[in-house]
């Protein structure tokens, strides 16, 4: 099974002297998830032609994947660390239902999909500890998530493949933006 960052003593310098919310730990954790996404994307692209498809917009309209916007304060222009940290946590919480959807979408990378899901949960906990303005963080309604999951799983095969591809691509972009922003916090 994939090892989470910090589980291996070689992985983190002086692991016991670092708070869980330290910049380095959070950075390592995000990079670990990004590595997992790369592995999942590889399997997705190998088994279907979704990665070259021009019909992404069709499927994207039916998904409400979290995305960074100027107003979120996570870009260099108009950077706002409090607003941005809330957006990162809220976005990760919103991605959880999509990561749940991915769990049955992989054959050879089943463990990797589980690792991405579990380490995202841990990352959310790390970031919640770091955030002071927790009141502004809205958690998605469990009932809304359940019905979304049912809807996604009821799609035809082509749409399911496209949805998988779009989730991975969007999650990768979201994490990369988060990584850049967290560096200045």
């Amino acid at each position: 099974a994939p090892v989470l960052p910090g589980e291996d003593s070689k992985d983190v310098a002086a692991p016991h002297s670092q708070p869980l919310t330290s910049s380095e730990r959070i950075d390592k954790h995000i990079r670990y998830i990004l590595d997992g996404i790369s592995a999942l994307r590889k399997e997705t692209c190998n088994r279907s032609n979704m990665c070259e498809s021009s019909k992404e917009a069709l499927a994207e309209n039916n998904l409400n994947l979290p995305k960074m916007a100027e107003k979120d304060g996570c870009f260099q222009s108009g950077f706002n660390e409090d607003t941005c940290l809330v957006k990162i946590i809220t976005g990760l919480l919103e991605f959880e239902v999509y990561l749940e959807y991915l769990q049955n979408r992989f054959e050879s990378s089943e463990e990797q999909a589980r690792a991405v899901q579990m380490s995202t949960k841990v990352l959310i906990q790390f970031l919640q500890k770091k955030a002071k303005n927790l009141d502004a963080i809205t958690t998605p309604e469990p009932t809304t998530n359940a019905s979304l999951l049912t809807k996604l799983q009821a799609q035809n095969q082509w749409l399911q493949d496209m949805t998988t591809h779009l989730i991975l691509r969007s999650f990768k972009e979201f994490l990369q933006s988060s990584l850049r922003a967290l560096r200045q916090m």
């Epitope: 670092q18 950075d27 660390e81 200045q184």
Partner: antibody, heavy 118, light 109 residues
């Protein structure tokens, strides 16, 4: 062009205080975490402190913790370092620098000399 | 406390290639340590060469390159020139702080 200009250094007695300033221009100051780094005569650089872009988080090296306070005023594009209970070993050139990120590297000022001596 | 280690001194012939390394007393250097490299000549402020492992600072000649090799960060100078004779310092983010190495004195002869 990125410019960082430190000021406020000088000669101070042990136990005294000093406030350093760093005026920044040529980049979006409020989007970058900022640091103070010092270099004692004949020694290598030593990281002193960092403040996040919005000023909400501050970090300190063990040797200055509890004595130095980093702060910033984004409306004035200025970084500060309040140094209290100064010791002889704090004698150094103090540099301010932005934290590399957003696709850009870190820039350093030319430094201001702080001498702690009786 | 984790110590950042560098070779105390190194020499290279003009036109030659040299690789300086930057390690940790405990653990491996990773991209999350954001290795940075600085050059300092006598009487001058340190000058940033490389940031975030392998990004060259603006205005830095392309003979300077950064990488992570094995468990260390590395600075490679390909085709060393006389003006490259200087002290080289690496810096690593460790936890929430930044630590500098003791520096490598590079001689070009």
């Amino acid at each position: 062009e990125v410019q960082l200009l430190e000021s406020g250094g000088g000669l101070v007695q042990p136990g005294g205080s000093l406030r350093l300033s760093c005026a920044a221009s040529g980049f979006t100051f409020s989007s970058y975490a900022m640091s103070w780094v010092r270099q004692a005569p004949g020694k290598g650089p030593e990281w002193v402190s960092r403040i996040s872009a919005g000023g909400g988080s501050t970090y300190y090296g063990d040797s200055v913790k509890g004595r130095f306070t980093i702060s910033r005023d984004n409306s004035k594009n200025t970084l500060y370092l309040q140094m209290n209970s100064l010791r002889a070993e704090d004698t150094a050139v103090y540099y301010c620098a932005n934290r590399a990120g957003w696709g850009a590297g870190d820039y350093w000022g030319q430094g201001t000399l702080v001498t702690v001596s009786s | 406390q984790t110590v950042v280690t560098q070779e105390p001194s190194f020499s290279v012939s003009p036109g030659g290639t040299v690789t300086l390394t930057c390690g940790l007393s405990s653990g491996s250097v990773t991209a999350s340590n954001y290795p940075g490299w600085y050059q300092q000549t006598p009487g001058q402020a340190p000058r940033a060469l490389i940031y975030s492992t392998n990004d060259r600072h603006s205005g830095v000649p392309d003979r300077f390159s950064g990488s992570i090799s094995g468990n260390k960060a590395a600075l490679t100078i390909t085709g060393a020139q006389a003006e490259d004779e200087a002290d080289y310092y690496c810096a690593l983010d460790i936890g929430d702080i930044t630590e500098f190495g003791g520096g490598t004195q590079l001689t070009v002869l």
